[in-house]
Interface confidence: medium
């Protein structure tokens, strides 16, 4: 039943974010005579679509629509009836799809073909469905967390509407992390950006923006699993793989199929003579540090500096959001706080992982035991990328906020991608402006 | 307490052959890889031959390889090493240990069992 | 094959001394190599695995570190019972391949 309400004059917009390891569809939502000004967007729901990633449906296409059904249901209802037809769906496949289109376009192009079927059977104004690339992906997580926290507003307020902010237009960069990608994205400080693969050039409500940008395929805490994996059992040589990243006690078969079925262990893939090999977790931060670090080729460099693997890494600056699988992790491990040092993270991280996992299971009763033993992996994995992927020091680490929501919506690519898609950032500064801000915060 | 103990050594003519046994005790065997390394009077440890936990890897040295087999039994906590055709340069001190990444990566050593290759 | 090429092959200190022994691994190994101890009655013990990483029970003036295909054991202060031979063998590939060994000797 619909809540029968006075007329707004508002807007909707969906986008579906469909991740490597599941989707998500979100709901915007804006006063419609504001379309221009910043900051007036804001997420009204979120729907976690029930099942994996779409690129685990290449097998069973036919199961796509029923996969979408609930969440886009679930649009049905939040929305009014008479905005459906001019309310834009965009759904947008990030690095899982782009593995899968690595491997095989036609099967790529088979998900994406039932996935727009599907979503054209709803009521909405369907846009098309489509990957998006790294540097896409990047790029839009920095203009959502932006613009959410009103850099590019030109006008300065006397109050603070965010958390994070610091009252100036400096903007945030942004770092997101995925299940089979990690995007970097910041304006530097009057440096060049030597590589024009990882340099945009933005004109946003009148102001221009050089932003550097880089998204590492392969580097998701999902796919970085993977990989670490498909290192360490080169070595082991043997049917048991003892893994300091995983909790003393815990033990899970991997088969060798699954461990070679991604693009991202092809580096490391040999013929090895058994079909299953068998975790043991030993529980040691120190070593599951040392084994991801190999993770990271820093002995090639073209330019003054890179981050790992021989791309092109400006020196960082400012203040940084860190969120999407940066933001989950570190929030589980209750290391968000603005007030934790990386010292005391890598303290509280040797810790988790020293304990065994009889123990970890009884304290996280509630938690899906395959996610709650990838965090010992997934929190060392996160400190390793950003001090020796990125660069980022004790002193610096202060400069890294841990963020989920900013005012209620959630840090992504979605918000920015439908920003842009719809055409509600300007390039020039509107001329005039109805309502000040405070009437509509 | 982790033990290995090396048997079957002895005197062997050229051409011969001979099995050494490792009994292991202490520890879950069944989990472990288990090496053979030898070392020749007054030279340097070589490595011999390497047996996975459940037998389906084995590797060997180019200088053994064809002569020696390395073998295992998980119920007996056992690890053996089939040598034929015998040489004078195989005459050595025979160590075995195990081994499992990370950690453990030969670090239990037994005391060793002689082979001398003579006529 | 892995050559793994160590030296000095023999040694004399006294006590008291820092020594340093060195393996240079021919390719890559990234950093799988552990160092182990012989002494004159046959015994191996392991005093190093992973490049840098004490065993237990093994006294802290023994160290382990890295420079690129170089690997150190180094003893910060001899005793009696450090006279001994010593071996670094690399485990990143088969075959196994140990360095010559270093003999260490009271001077």
């Known amino acids: 039943t619909q809540n029968k309400a006075l007329p707004e004059n508002v807007k909707y917009g969906i986008v579906l974010d469909a991740g490597s390891s599941h989707t998500s569809l979100y709901i915007y939502k804006w006063p419609a005579e504001k379309e221009n000004d910043t900051g007036v967007v804001h997420q009204v729901e979120e729907c976690r679509v029930k099942g994996p990633g779409i690129s685990k449906f290449v097998q069973k296409v036919n199961e796509i629509g029923i996969y979408l059904t609930d969440c886009m249901e679930r649009a049905r209802e939040v929305i009014p009836r008479s905005q459906h037809q001019e309310t834009p769906v965009y759904l947008g496949a990030t690095a899982g799809m782009r593995l899968l289109r690595m491997e095989s376009e036609e099967l790529a192009d088979r998900v994406l073909d039932v996935v727009e079927r599907s979503l054209s059977n709803y009521p909405f104004d369907f846009q098309g469905a489509r990957i998006i690339t790294g540097q896409e992906e990047g790029a839009y997580g920095w203009i959502t967390i932006n613009y959410l926290l009103g850099k590019f507003s030109q006008k300065t307020r006397w109050f603070s509407i965010v958390p994070y902010e610091t009252n100036n237009q400096e903007t945030f960069g942004a770092l997101d992390l995925g299940g089979a990608s990690t995007q970097v994205t910041f304006v530097p400080q009057n440096q060049t950006i030597e590589s024009p693969d990882n340099a945009l050039q933005f004109r946003l409500y009148g102001k221009d923006y050089n932003v550097y940008t880089h998204s590492f395929l392969c580097y998701g805490k999902d796919q970085a699993l993977w990989q670490k994996l498909a290192k360490d059992i080169q070595v082991a040589s043997n049917e048991i793989l003892r893994d300091p990243c995983f909790h003393p006690g815990y033990k899970k078969v991997v088969n060798v199929s699954d461990l070679y079925k991604t693009p991202c262990t092809k580096r490391f893939e040999m013929t090895l003579p058994f079909q299953q090999f068998e975790i043991q977790g030993i529980g040691n931060y120190q070593q599951c540090h040392q084994s991801i670090l190999e993770l990271f080729n820093t002995s090639y460099c073209p330019y003054s500096q890179c981050a790992f693997n021989g791309i092109f890494l400006p020196p960082l600056q400012g203040d940084f959001g860190a969120f999407s699988a940066f933001y989950f992790v570190m929030k589980f491990l209750n290391l968000t706080s603005e007030k934790v040092s990386q010292e005391k993270v890598t303290e509280m991280m040797k810790k988790f992982c020293a304990q065994p996992w009889e123990e970890i299971k009884t304290s996280y009763a509630g938690v899906k035991e395959k996610y709650l033993s990838e965090y010992c992996f997934s929190g060392t994995y996160i400190l390793s990328l950003l001090l020796q992927g990125y660069h980022f020091t004790a002193d610096s680490w202060e400069h890294i906020h841990f963020i989920g929501k900013i005012q209620g919506s959630d840090a992504g690519w979605t918000l920015g991608y439908m920003l842009n898609l719809t055409n509600m950032i300007p390039a020039e500064q509107p001329l005039s402006t109805p309502l000040s801000h405070s009437t509509y915060v | 307490e982790v033990q290995l103990v090396e048997s079957g050594g002895g005197l062997v003519k050229p051409g011969g052959s001979l099995k050494l046994s490792c009994a292991a005790s202490g520890f879950t065997f069944s989990d472990y890889g288990m090496h053979w390394v030898r070392q020749a009077p007054e030279k340097g440890l070589e490595w011999v031959a390497y047996?996975?936990?459940?037998?389906?890897?084995?590797y060997y040295a180019d200088t053994v390889k064809g002569r020696f087999t390395i073998s295992r039994d998980n119920a007996k906590n056992t690890l053996f090493l089939q040598m034929a055709s015998l040489r004078s340069e195989d005459t050595a001190m025979y160590y075995c240990?195990?081994?499992?990444?990370?950690?453990?990566?030969?670090?239990?050593w037994g005391q060793g069992t002689t082979l001398t290759v003579s006529s | 094959d892995i050559q793994m090429t160590q030296s000095p092959s023999s040694l004399s200190a006294s006590l008291g001394e820092r020594v340093s022994l060195t393996c240079r691994a021919s390719?890559?190994?990234?950093?799988?190599l552990i160092w182990l101890q012989q002494k004159p009655g046959g015994t191996i013990k392991r005093l190093i695995y992973?490049?840098?990483t004490l065993d237990s029970g093994v006294p802290k003036r023994f160290s382990g570190s890295r420079s690129g295909s170089d690997y150190s054991l180094t003893i910060s202060s001899l005793e009696s019972e450090d006279f001994a031979d010593y071996y670094c063998?690399?485990?990143?590939?088969?075959?196994?391949?140990f360095g010559g060994g270093t003999k260490l000797e009271i001077k």
């Open positions: 063998l690399q485990y990143t590939s088969y075959p196994r391949t």
């Open positions: 047996i996975s936990s459940g037998s389906s890897i084995m």
């Open positions: 992973a490049a840098s």
């Open positions: 390719q890559e190994i990234r950093g799988y």
């Open positions: 240990a195990r081994d499992l990444y990370y950690d453990h990566v030969l670090d239990y």
